[in-house]
Interface confidence: medium
Amino acid sequence: LEVSESPGSVQVARGQTAVLPCAFSTSAALLNLNVIWMVIPLSNANQPEQVILYQGGQMFDGALRFHGRVGFTGTMPATNVSIFINNTQLSDTGTYQCLVNNLPDRGGRNIGVTGLTVLVPPSAPQCQIQGSQDLGSDVILLCSSEEGIPRPTYLWEKLDNTLKLPPTATQDQVQGTVTIRNISALSSGLYQCVASNAIGTSTCLLDLQVISPQPRSV
């Protein structure tokens, strides 16, 4: 019995269906096929869980969190024992193993390993202004998303015809900050932060209103 080399890893957006491949070749009839799918969750590597089991011509549920979401992609028994996971969750990320036995066929590699990464688009970031908006002050525009896998990068732009930040601005796309020094009336306006990763983007807006000192009455 020989389990085929798997492609290594599968990436899927949260909520979508993941297909985890596993196929084998055997010299024996599929009368005593036994397939166990296990997962070593990324969030808890010390606690492997059973995903689904095929034994004695019957399918059995694994861990409670997979109930109703997991099945074999084809009619069993078969030499393709790939599974699907519906409505993928962040907690499904991990290393999946298919263990195949088909007596009396012995020997060879009977384990296939596939990594699953569940990707999450950035949630709408939260925009914040730090510092006084008085003329001549320094302000920091802050932007961060609570969710996003891979970790989002952040691009700030001033929503005018140029989409460019003021010349006195410095941007950190990893931290999601923009520092604007010595703000002037030209600094006023709408600023948009775009949080993006491999599978999505989302935005937030800031309305920077530079406050000019009121002329004093004599």
């Epitope: 949630s123 009336a185 306006g189 948009q192 807006l205």
Partner: antibody
Framework: EVQLLESGGGLVQPGGSLRLSCAAS????????MSWVRQAPGKGLEWVSA????????YYADSVKGRFTISRDNSKNTLYLQMNSLRAEDTAVYYC???????????????????WGQGTLVTVSS | DIQMTQSPSSLSASVGDRVTITCRAS??????LNWYQQKPGKAPKLLIY???SLQSGVPSRFSGSGSGTDFTLTISSLQPEDFATYYC?????????FGQGTKVEIK
Amino acid sequence: EVQLLESGGGLVQPGGSLRLSCAASGFTFSSYAMSWVRQAPGKGLEWVSAISGSGGSTYYADSVKGRFTISRDNSKNTLYLQMNSLRAEDTAVYYCARHEVFGTSSGYHLYAFDIWGQGTLVTVSS
Amino acid sequence: DIQMTQSPSSLSASVGDRVTITCRASQSISSYLNWYQQKPGKAPKLLIYAASSLQSGVPSRFSGSGSGTDFTLTISSLQPEDFATYYCQQWSGLPLTFGQGTKVEIK
């Protein structure tokens, strides 16, 4: 009392022009960004254009870009919307609205239209 | 553009009823969501900002909830003056967009 009062609406032929005004009172006008929002008869609300407090930055919906111009005169506490090349689909009640910023406990900024004018009707018809 | 979809588009209810209106955004907008009430021939009025914060002067029977893409406006006990059209509106990205409105009518 905080108030916005639009004027300048009326009947105009397709291809014509109109200038709407919005007079603000009861607040420091120059400290607030402002928007125009319109509502076609029997329809929902549609954001049209916005302008920063200083007047230095302007924003438009795609449906009016290149035809409408938003501006303000902070010395007169007045917001304007110059509408050119008017079309039948521009027929609507036009409202001016103030942008208010609301801070949250976590420190981030949210905005809403907290004060609206009573609206002025623009009818584009031949 | 961020699309805002309200449901239902209209509903009939009686005074004292609990009414729920939902609003769904086409992408995550965090809590950048406002609710407005509009009566015939009048300008819209801000009810709820930041998804769940009650605007000053608005009765406490109005409440908002939700975050991300799904939001709800609830009127705990409908009063005669609450018969109106309600709009949600996002402030996460330009263009600023509104839902199509939900008309609350007397049963």
